[in-house]
């Protein structure tokens, strides 16, 4: 059974993941329309369902494409460091949260970068609210 300390640690990690995803989404939405419309040409893969921590494997698999798109959009922009930091944070947090169990992602739809970040934000929020109730 999970101890209160491990539950607390998971909660903190989910809070951190949520924060980093929100930082990325804010960055995307802050781009002037000229950049955003071009970013929307890229597609990201979402699994059939995201309800458990092990499903974070599917987020991990999309982090490299996500970083590439954000870097392409930024070009020589000074925000590049923030993106790399957020992606790195997400990578570390996801590795801690998803556990060692191997999970095969079944992707069933492609979405834009905005939808992708919003869906994973919603996932974090739902897990956080479920574990705090």
């Amino acid at each position: 059974a999970p101890t209160s300390s491990s539950t607390k640690e998971t909660q903190e990690q989910l809070d951190q993941l949520l924060l980093d995803l929100q930082v990325l989404l804010k960055g995307v939405n802050d781009y002037k329309n000229s950049k955003l419309s071009r970013m929307l040409t890229f597609k990201f893969y979402m699994p059939k369902k995201v309800t458990e921590l092990k499903h974070l494997q599917c987020l991990e698999e999309e982090l490299k494409p996500l970083e590439e798109v954000l870097n392409l959009a930024q070009g020589k922009n000074s925000h590049g460091g923030n993106t790399r930091e957020s992606i790195s944070n997400i990578n570390v947090t996801v590795l801690k949260l998803k556990g060692s169990e191997t999970f095969m992602c079944e992707y069933d739809e492609t979405v834009t970068i905005v939808e992708f970040l919003n869906r994973w934000i919603t996932f974090c929020q739902s897990i956080i609210s479920a574990s705090s109730s």
Epitope: K32, N33, S34, T41, F42, K43
Partner: antibody, heavy 117, light 108 residues
Framework: EVQLVQSGTEVKKAGDSLKISCKGS????????IGWVRQMPGRGLEWMGT????????RYSPSFQGQVTMSADKSISTAYLQWGSLRASDTAMYYC??????????WGQGTMVTVSS | SYELTQPPSVSVSPGQTARITCSGD??????AYWYQQKSGQAPVLVIY???KRPSGIPERFSGSSSGTTVTLTISDVQAEDDADYYC??????????FGAGTKLTVLG
């Protein structure tokens, strides 16, 4: 109603200069890319490039770089495509189109340009 | 330079289903868009982001994607669907490109 209205048919001689226009209405012209597309007689669509009217950021297809110039005057919601020296091979229909959510959702009616040698 | 490959022509009888494919190396990571162009008219967007249909486009038009190939499907084909169909996408460096186009002929 959201629309793009293009200037009329042009008949020119090789070596002439030309500037055709595309006027947007019914939406915030500044904040959407305007693309230009060429269609030679009996042929397919070719993407020439695109301009963002708010700051005139411009991207050209490698095939058209240096051959044409794209510009925009956001004060009158109009984008332009111009040639310094026309060739017979520039004979084509030219379309402007609005780029929204990464697709060209609104198209002008086209401007036919005929260049005689 | 980046290319999108389409069949030159597809022929179907009214009421049948037409499928037009478009292949390109970047399509696993870049959305595709489909345009219909009837003779003497400007192109019209019929599918965007692989599968989405703009308002005003009949439900008979649908899009799908698998790996490096996207497909435009027109079910219960009507005489008015007789047109050229172009796929469009962007390469990895964000330069846009159209396929060469597919002429859909509705027989009869």
């Amino acid at each position: 109603e959201v629309q793009l209205v293009q200037s009329g048919t042009e008949v020119k001689k090789a070596g002439d200069s030309l500037k055709i226009s595309c006027k947007g209405s019914g939406y915030n012209f500044d904040t959407y890319w305007i693309g230009w597309v060429r269609q030679m007689p009996g042929r397919g669509l070719e993407w020439m490039g695109t301009i963002y009217p708010a700051d005139s950021d411009t991207r050209y297809s490698p095939s058209f770089q240096g051959q044409v110039t794209m510009s925009a005057d956001k004060s009158i919601s109009t984008a332009y495509l111009q040639w310094g020296s026309l060739r017979a091979s520039d004979t084509a229909m030219y379309y402007c189109a609005r780029f929204s959510s990464s697709a060209y959702d609104i198209w002008g009616q086209g401007t036919m340009v005929t260049v005689s040698s | 330079s980046y290319e999108l490959t389409q069949p030159p022509s597809v022929s179907v009888s009214p009421g049948q289903t037409a499928r037009i494919t478009c292949s390109g190396d970047a399509l696993p990571r870049k959305f595709a868009y489909w345009y219909q162009q009837k003779s003497g008219q400007a192109p019209v967007l019929v599918i965007y982001q692989d599968t989405k249909r703009p308002s005003g486009i009949p439900e008979r038009f649908s899009g799908s994607s698998s790996g490096t190939t996207v497909t435009l499907t027109i079910s219960d084909v009507q005489a008015e669907d007789d047109a050229d169909y172009y796929c469009q996408s962007a390469d990895r460096s964000d330069s846009y490109v159209f396929g060469a186009g597919t002429k859909l002929t509705v027989l009869g």
